[in-house]
């Protein structure tokens, strides 16, 4: 899996979308988990409704919501009031029994809100930033990591 980067601004909402084959994953519940470090296990944050037919209902865990369009094949996760410590590696998962298939690997990047710091003399100065086009709308900027940006083995 490539890793897709979703950029959000601190204090705002970030929406992450994970497309999937609706036929292949028919009848399966979905989950959103946070990976511990680059290679660590993925800890469940929130999962869709226990009844698959009700997967369209939004479920919350704290400030994180999940909803599944099972016909269209799109899992959507919303991180409300994004905070610095929300940054990290995540996965969208399709559940079957005790197993989980990875639908998408996601890097959530938390950027500074320039409006919070407009009076500060010694701090955040956004350079060219595609994510600051509109500081008040829910949005996400996504990009896939380039081929040259694959993990490389630790040096000995």
């Amino acid at each position: 899996h490539n890793t897709t980067v979703f950029q959000g601004v601190a204090g705002q909402s970030l929406q992450v979308s994970c497309p999937y084959d609706s036929m292949k994953h028919w009848g399966r519940r979905k989950a959103w988990c946070r990976q511990l470090g680059e290679k660590g296990p993925c800890q469940r944050v929130v999962s869709t409704h226990n009844l698959w037919l009700l997967s369209f209902l939004r479920r919350w865990n704290g400030s994180t919501a999940i909803t599944d369009d099972t016909l269209g094949g799109t899992l959507t996760i919303t991180l409300r009031n994004l905070q610095p410590h929300d940054a990290g590696l995540y996965q969208c998962q399709s559940l079957h029994g005790s197993e989980a298939d990875t639908l998408r690997k996601v890097l959530v990047e938390v950027l500074a809100d320039p409006l919070d710091h407009r009076d500060a003399g010694d701090l955040w100065f956004p350079g060219e930033s595609e994510s600051f086009e509109d500081a008040h709308v829910e949005h996400s900027i996504s990009r896939s990591l380039l081929e040259g940006e694959i993990p490389f083995p630790p040096t000995s």
Partner: antibody
Framework: EVQLVESGGGLVQPGRSLKLSCAAS????????MAWVRQAPTKGLEWVAS????????YYRDSVKGRFTISRDNAKNTLYLQMDSLRSEDTATYYC?????????????WGQGTLVTVSS | NIQLTQSPSLLSASVGDRVTLSCKGS??????LAWYQQKLGEAPKLLIY???SLQTGIPSRFSGSGSGTDYTLTISSLHSEDLATYYC????????FGGGTKLELK
């Protein structure tokens, strides 16, 4: 093992330029926000500039804004700091610092630093 | 912008002592505070982030606490290798380091 190795420091005259590099290894460079932090001789730490994972978002402290440019090359796993119009008060050890995954808010690993001396 | 004041600037203590270092912000930091240790001639090392989260590999004798504008780093039992300068650092509004507290042997 995470490694950050700075290079490019040295003695430079006021008004001249210098470009620092930081070679990263032991982790997936493109996952992490990066920054430069400096420390003048016998003084405390001072944040200089930060850059997002893809390089599209850059942040600078007021005193270097318009003179310094932070950039990165994810294909080469390298962070840069282009320093122009250098002043004597820019004299310091410059540390390359790695943020956490997806952020530059705090710094989890630091290089050993490279000394920049601005003097005539 | 947020200023951080560390006290004392110099602290003398003995091995085995319980040591408390203070950091005060000029405005609310919302728990977005970290502590760094820097030994002479070395790069800083992250000890604690988000007020009280211990960085991986850091001994449990280090702990952090506080809220609002006032924060504390505690070393429960001082070891000789803990002698260093300690910096607090806030990331609630930009990036600001405190002036440091130098911890020396009494």
């Amino acid at each position: 093992e995470v490694q950050l190795v700075e290079s490019g420091g040295g003695l430079v005259q006021p008004g001249r330029s210098l470009k620092l590099s930081c070679a990263a290894s032991g982790f997936t460079f493109s996952y992490y926000g990066m920054a430069w932090v400096r420390q003048a001789p016998t003084k405390g730490l001072e944040w200089v500039a930060s850059i997002s994972t893809g390089g599209g978002n850059t942040y600078y402290r007021d005193s270097v804004k318009g003179r310094f440019t932070i950039s990165r090359d994810n294909a080469k796993n390298t962070l840069y700091l282009q320093m122009d119009s250098l002043r004597s008060e820019d004299t310091a050890t410059y540390y390359c610092a790695r943020g956490d995954i997806g952020t530059t808010y705090w710094f989890t690993y630091w290089g050993q630093g490279t000394l920049v001396t601005v003097s005539s | 912008n947020i200023q951080l004041t560390q006290s004392p600037s110099l602290l003398s203590a003995s091995v085995g002592d319980r040591v408390t270092l203070s950091c005060k912000g000029s405005q609310n930091i919302n728990n977005y505070l970290a502590w760094y240790q820097q030994k002479l001639g070395e790069a800083p090392k992250l000890l604690i982030y988000k007020t009280n989260s211990l960085q991986t590999g850091i001994p449990s004798r280090f702990s952090g606490s506080g809220s609002g504008t006032d924060y504390t780093l505690t070393i429960s039992s001082l070891h000789s290798e803990d002698l260093a300068t300690y910096y607090c650092y806030q990331y609630n509004n930009g990036w600001t380091f405190g002036g440091g507290t130098k911890l020396e042997l009494k």
